[in-house]
Amino acid sequence: DAHKSEVAHRFKDLGEENFKALVLIAFAQYLQQCPFEDHVKLVNEVTEFAKTCVADESAENCDKSLHTLFGDKLCTVATLRETYGEMADCCAKQEPERNECFLQHKDDNPNLPRLVRPEVDVMCTAFHDNEETFLKKYLYEIARRHPYFYAPELLFFAKRYKAAFTECCQAADKAACLLPKLDELRDEGKASSAKQRLKCASLQKFGERAFKAWAVARLSQRFPKAEFAEVSKLVTDLTKVHTECCHGDLLECADDRADLAKYICENQDSISSKLKECCEKPLLEKSHCIAEVENDEMPADLPSLAADFVESKDVCKNYAEAKDVFLGMFLYEYARRHPDYSVVLLLRLAKTYETTLEKCCAAADPHECYAKVFDEFKPLVEEPQNLIKQNCELFEQLGEYKFQNALLVRYTKKVPQVSTPTLVEVSRNLGKVGSKCCKHPEAKRMPCAEDYLSVVLNQLCVLHEKTPVSDRVTKCCTESLVNRRPCFSALEVDETYVPKEFNAETFTFHADICTLSEKERQIKKQTALVELVKHKPKATKEQLKAVMDDFAAFVEKCCKADDKETCFAEEGKKLVAASQAALGL
């Protein structure tokens, strides 16, 4: 439906508050280094312009595309060249190339200071003094650090952020009320950002077909009672929403997401019995709730898949007539029967089925050729089952911190060229799979674990893409989206790696470690562990464990000492010498 003025259309659909918030997110995700005040000024200018277009859609420039309007506005920033270097060259381009250029310069790991949480009283004062600025600042700080954050979902986070301050700044014990809520929002926010980053990577690196296949599998698991045509419609709409958000079209994305939530709620009866509660909520909560809704129960007495996809004499005819539709039906039918499988496993099965049909439908006796195709699925199903069993046993034996350490060693030996901060971050996140998924019964373990690992390995892939250092990481990240995890699982110790020179400074610790939070202290120790493996990649698990145990005892001892700094200096020298001897450094 064509509108004379796209900016007026979106302003009216979304309302001023959401319009301003989404434009701020869009600008902060593009120009990640710009100061808050500069962004607010740009947003206010765009908003004032939008209002003139609402008043008169024929007014000057109101017919321009959003990309043109927003891009022109971003290109007015005076310090673009000094702050962003070659990104300033984007401004010499015309749309749509200019927007593509901005997208390519989004930085997954921007050089920004860590967000330090002020004292509760300081935050509450700031909240009361200027609530609007306080909440805008939240949107700005999250958006610039997470340039692919799902914008309509960030509005939902901001709403919860506001509610936390509204409630807790009036509480008797403000800190006890507020801090757990902020911790929860931070952790959920990081998870939400990583999940969305995988969706954008799927679309941008592997194309719409890959994303649609993922969506068919996931929605079929979630809505097993829905017809294939219904699932297909939802997949088409969902793909449009995510394509827009990943492409920086945040106003269209938020608008279309609201329309999709409305459609789902109006058609609950033909989609899922689990949507009732979600659909009673306000818009932002409703959309979030639908996205997280539990799988509906499978219809009773679903027939065997073999009849339509192996035994039927029309398999090759049906496949040839509409390949992607037929494969989509296969994926839908398989996924709705298997909520116990990960999405990536379902996609591997569909790929195996497709490969078999491609080969067999050109053979002399197609049916004879593809008759045993389902037998090929067995090892594909058993592979993640076995690995999850092994890793959950290891997690239960070690606990989260030591399980993370085992993964740190595993991945550092496989890809030692990757930067230490990236190895620590990724391995810590991989290790969280234990607490997140191993508690589940067998039927929920695989979808929990393997789909979570896909999200975390994508973090490794996007961070590595910024500064590529390892051909093996590039290969695992680019060859196949659904086989990234098996590719990393199969990697060997990198025999070509030349061990890092020993640097005593890397293993020198000071009394400041004693005042760190438990998490920060773990990160310090895990950083040392990675460095240790980089120095001695052939060290055995037993050797590394012994050194790490000594190291933990050393930190504990010196943090209890009266003269901590002297203890760290003297005992540290002894520990380094002993570790060198133990590892033959």
Epitope: P379, K413, K414
Partner: nanobody
Framework: QVQLVESGGGLVQAGGSLRLSCAAS??????MGWFRQAPGNEREFVAS????????NYANSVKGRFRISKDNAKNTVLLQMNSLKPEDTAVYYC????????????WGQGTQVTVSS
């Protein structure tokens, strides 16, 4: 447990070819590989293949000359060695690992490969 039995070693002229075979019984391994050890040297990695997906890894020294493959039906891994050089002379060991850690849990007895110049 995984039991591994190698075969196919022998004496060959430089530039010639050999095919090593390793039969696995017991549990299905996750990855199977070949290592080699020449007299006075450390054991070194040669090649590996993941059982389910067929992902392969090769040492730089054998890339383009050696090819690892598997026969799932026979639970066997093959190492086709072409353009052999005297420096390929070693005892070749088949090995298996049961999981993602790049350390091998099970080892065969080894088979001697001698390349004469």
């Amino acid at each position: 447990q995984v039991q591994l039995v190698e075969s196919g070693g022998g004496l060959v002229q430089a530039g010639g070819s050999l095919r090593l075979s390793c039969a696995a019984s017991g549990r299905t391994p996750y990855v199977m590989g070949w290592f080699r050890q020449a007299p006075g040297n450390e054991r070194e990695f040669v090649a590996s293949i993941s059982w389910t997906y067929g992902y392969t890894n090769y040492a730089n020294s054998v890339k383009g000359r050696f090819r690892i493959s598997k026969d799932n039906a026979k639970n066997t891994v093959l190492l086709q060695m072409n353009s052999l050089k005297p420096e390929d002379t070693a005892v070749y060991y088949c090995a298996a690992r049961r999981g993602e850690d790049p350390e091998y849990d099970y080892w065969g007895q080894g088979t001697q490969v001698t390349v004469s110049s």
